[in-house]
């Protein structure tokens, strides 16, 4: 955690556990209004190393949808069309945050969970073993 | 927000705002235990995009340590090493949640906030605008 | 049901060419990816060609220049042509699903159209 | 090409048996994603192959449980617990990790 003195103007916590246990307000602010709002839209198309996008749905997380990316292929897709297995598509991970119900059910309380998402793919060269 | 039904184990909430102020338990949990250990780590160099990454810190956010990935080419990598600028390296963007500190310096309580992050690149191929 | 079912003509003629159809019935071309396999008699089996999903398309490099492969979605049917045929490419021909959770194996087979290759 | 070797090529077995086949691949089947795209298929007299086994030891839904794939890397194996006369035939290794797909020359479970 990071020692930050109490402000005096702060919302009291009388939790025998703080600073684990904290208030959230889920008004969220977005910060992205300034940027371009095509973003990665089309990238998982135009692509060498194209991906579908699959729906993860949770009631029990927040947010609940979650877009989970799925490399089309092996291998990259050359300018002829042609997928190339000499070079390989693979997804790009990122570990996000999210907050889980808990107890389940619960409407107002909710733990930080940590999970590993597949954003998009990118094409590598791969690692060659060969056996002797 | 999710209409799920009040379980009576659940802590009570006397917050007049309820349901946009909410406790969370900043104990994380993970749910990468089982994933592949090699994730994304070297593909930012081996990638026909490769990237860089930057480290963002700001001690009023949590996680406070965000780490940005700029496209090191506006072309991508060929297999003789050169750049071909047939191609683009675009950044593979996701919005991510954070907590931001509010009021700020405020130890135990945030406010839910949407942020963009440049997750990796992927070359994909230009669109080409002609001129009549 | 997942169903393939590949339609050619039986008997070529060496140096002509070779047109077989696999029309498909309980999934869609524009999901799965479709494979041409071969199996000359009492022999084992050689992949030839996939095309994928999204039209794309994987060649075995060593028949990459005698063979074609395209789809019409709207008709589930994917064509497979091969040019110059020789003797030795009397087989068993196959179209072959693409395996489903990005499997990459193949998980539905057609029951296969036999080829000959004789004068 | 990636080379398939299967040991052995012909297996006589009495029912009731286990059945282990060999599958060694001439380079490693791990793709950069850390999967490994190394299946087994089945060839009964006259029909198709069918799927038993995808990415290493996965089983292929209706596949029994007494079949079942181990290995890693460049070595692999298809064990049957308890061979049933429904299981005879030809065993085919194959990898999807490099193109062009290849597999094994087959190994023919067959009664003693």
């Known amino acids: 955690g990071i020692a930050i003195p109490r402000n005096s103007g702060c919302p009291n916590s009388e939790d025998k556990n703080f600073p684990r246990t904290v208030m959230v307000n889920l008004n969220i602010h977005n910060r992205n209004t300034s940027t371009n709002p095509k973003r990665s839209s089309d990238y998982y198309n135009r692509s060498t190393s194209p991906w579908n996008l699959h729906r993860n749905e949770d009631p029990e997380r927040y947010p609940s949808v979650i877009w989970e990316a799925k490399c089309r292929h092996l291998g990259c897709v050359k300018a002829d069309g042609n997928v190339d297995y000499h070079m390989n598509s693979v997804p790009i991970q990122q570990e996000i945050l999210v907050l889980r119900r808990e107890p389940r059910h619960c409407p107002n309380s909710f733990r930080l969970e940590k999970i590993l998402v597949s954003v998009g793919c990118t094409c590598v060269t791969p690692i060659v073993h060969h056996v002797a | 927000g999710i209409a799920i039904p009040r379980n009576s184990g659940c802590p009570n909430s006397e917050d007049k705002n309820f349901p946009r102020t909410v406790m969370v338990n900043l104990n994380i949990h993970n749910r990468n235990t089982s994933t592949n250990p090699k994730r994304s780590s070297d593909y930012y160099n081996r990638s026909t995009s490769p990237w860089n990454l930057h480290r963002n810190e700001d001690p009023e956010r949590y996680p406070s340590v965000i780490w940005e990935a700029k496209c090191r080419h506006l072309g991508c990598v060929k297999a003789d090493g050169n750049v071909d600028y047939h191609m683009n390296s675009v950044p593979i963007q996701q919005e991510i949640l954070v907590l931001r500190r509010e009021p700020r310096h405020c130890p135990n309580s945030f406010r839910l906030e949407k942020i963009l992050v440049s997750v990796g690149c992927t070359c994909v191929t230009p669109i080409v605008h002609h001129v009549a | 049901q997942v169903e393939l079912k590949e339609s050619g003509p039986g008997l070529v003629a060496p140096s002509q060419s070779l047109s077989i159809t696999c029309t498909v019935s309980g999934f869609s071309l524009t999901s799965y990816g479709v494979y041409w396999v071969r199996q000359p008699p009492g022999k084992g089996l050689e992949w030839l060609v996939v095309i994928w999903s999204d039209g794309t398309t994987t060649y075995n490099s060593a028949l990459k220049s005698r063979l074609s492969i395209s789809k019409d979605n709207s008709k589930s049917q994917v064509f497979l042509k091969m040019n110059s045929l020789q003797t030795d490419d009397t087989a068993m021909y196959y179209c072959?699903?693409?395996?489903?959770?990005?499997?990459?194996?193949?998980?539905?087979w057609g029951q296969g159209t036999a080829v000959t290759v004789s004068s | 090409d990636v080379v398939m070797i299967q040991i052995p090529l012909s297996l006589p077995v009495s029912l009731g048996d286990q059945a282990s086949i060999s599958c060694r691949s001439s380079?490693?089947?791990?793709?950069?994603?850390?999967?490994?795209?190394l299946h087994w298929y089945l060839q009964k007299p006259g029909q198709s192959p069918k799927l038993l086994i995808y990415k290493v030891f996965n089983r292929f839904s209706g596949v029994p449980d007494r079949f079942s794939g181990s290995g890693s890397g460049t070595d692999f194996t298809l064990k049957i617990s308890r061979v049933e006369a429904e299981d005879l035939g030809v065993y085919f290794c194959?990898?999807?990790?490099?193109?062009?797909?290849?597999f094994g020359a087959g190994t023919k479970l067959e009664l003693k």
């Open positions: 194959s990898q999807s990790t490099h193109a062009p797909l290849t």
């Open positions: 072959a699903r693409q395996g489903d959770n990005y499997s990459y194996a193949v998980d539905y």
């Open positions: 380079q490693s089947l791990v793709h950069s994603n850390g999967n490994t795209y």
